[in-house]
């Protein structure tokens, strides 16, 4: 088998402009690859939506805060 | 690829300060914030800092507040990281190394400052 | 702040080992955890970030695991290029710490 994974790079040109509510958040994928043009954040909303974001922005960086610590309480 | 360029090791005297820089390429630093870790001879690592350039903001370990100054030139993509007051502990290799999510994907290749009278 | 422990300081193990290395924080550290592969004179390299995603490029035996403020890395059967040290770092919230690192050496 290989020794390392290759995975398809997903890359965040532009990102969203506005505060997404907490509870319409489902997931979040750090993207740091640097073949990409910028680090950022992609969230998955409940609806099954994608939409990239500014891991600089505050509200950003709390929402990842906040799926963080429910995602620990869920674990038995 | 990304590169982070440091400038060369230094020697300087006890109370001195020391000014270490560190150039990019391949990225724009205003995409990311640029950070600066330290290690002194045979020890581990410490995190010193970080500066947003975008906006300039810093924020630093309250070991270093007041006595450590990062800034920025987004015009040449370089950071800076000043240390003041110099003293025989601060002797170290001096790293920056980028990362928006506070873990360091890309480091320069170190910069030695030594303290000595 | 928060501090990290890594166990042990030092090993030694053969090549073909399997090698485990522990963090424990001093708090829940939600998964924000790194670790790090440094060789004498060189800067660190970033294995792993988020307690468990390899980056891109490192060899899969490398894994990590853990949760709340018990962290492991794992290497499941030791090359020769993995004799180095390895640091963990919190990065739950600043001022982020490291670990105070493991030196694997040859047996």
């Known amino acids: 088998q290989p020794d390392s994974v290759s995975i398809p790079i997903t890359c965040c040109f532009n990102v969203i402009n506005r505060k997404i509510p907490i509870q319409r958040l489902e997931s979040y994928t750090r993207i740091t690859n640097i073949q990409c043009p910028k680090e950022a954040v992609i969230f998955k909303t409940k609806r099954g939506k994608e939409v990239c974001a500014d891991p600089k922005e505050r509200w950003v960086r709390d929402s990842m805060k906040h799926l963080d610590q429910i995602f620990q309480n869920l674990k038995p | 690829q990304v590169q982070l360029v440091q400038s060369g090791a230094e020697v300087k005297k006890p109370g001195s300060s020391v000014k270490v820089s560190c150039k990019a390429s391949?990225?724009?630093?205003?995409?990311?914030?640029m950070h600066w870790v330290r290690q002194a001879p045979g020890q581990g690592l410490e995190w010193i800092g970080r500066?947003?350039?975008?906006?300039?903001?810093?924020k630093f370990d309250p070991k270093f507040q007041g006595r450590a100054t990062i800034t920025a030139d987004t015009s040449t993509s370089t950071a800076y990281m000043e240390l003041s007051s110099l003293r025989s502990e601060d002797t170290a290799v001096y790293y920056c190394?980028?990362?928006?999510?506070?873990?360091?994907?890309?480091w320069g290749q170190g910069t030695t400052v030594t303290v000595s009278s | 702040d928060i501090q990290m422990t890594q166990s042990p300081s030092s090993l030694s193990a053969s090549v073909g080992d399997r090698v485990t290395i522990t963090c424990k924080a001093t708090e829940d550290i939600y998964n924000r955890l790194a670790w790090y592969q440094q060789k004498p004179g060189k800067a660190p390299k970033l294995l792993i970030s988020g307690a468990t995603s390899l980056e891109t490029g490192v060899p899969s035996r490398f894994s990590g695991s853990g949760s709340g403020t018990d962290y492991t890395l794992t290497i499941s059967s030791l090359q020769p290029e993995d004799f180095a040290t390895y640091y963990c770092?919190?990065?739950?919230?600043?001022?982020?710490?490291f670990g105070g690192g493991t030196k694997v050496e040859i047996k």
């Open positions: 500066i947003d350039p975008a906006n300039g903001n810093t």
């Open positions: 770092q919190q990065f739950w919230s600043a001022p982020y710490t």
């Open positions: 190394a980028r990362g928006v999510f506070g873990f360091f994907d890309y």
């Open positions: 391949g990225l724009n630093i205003k995409d990311t914030y």
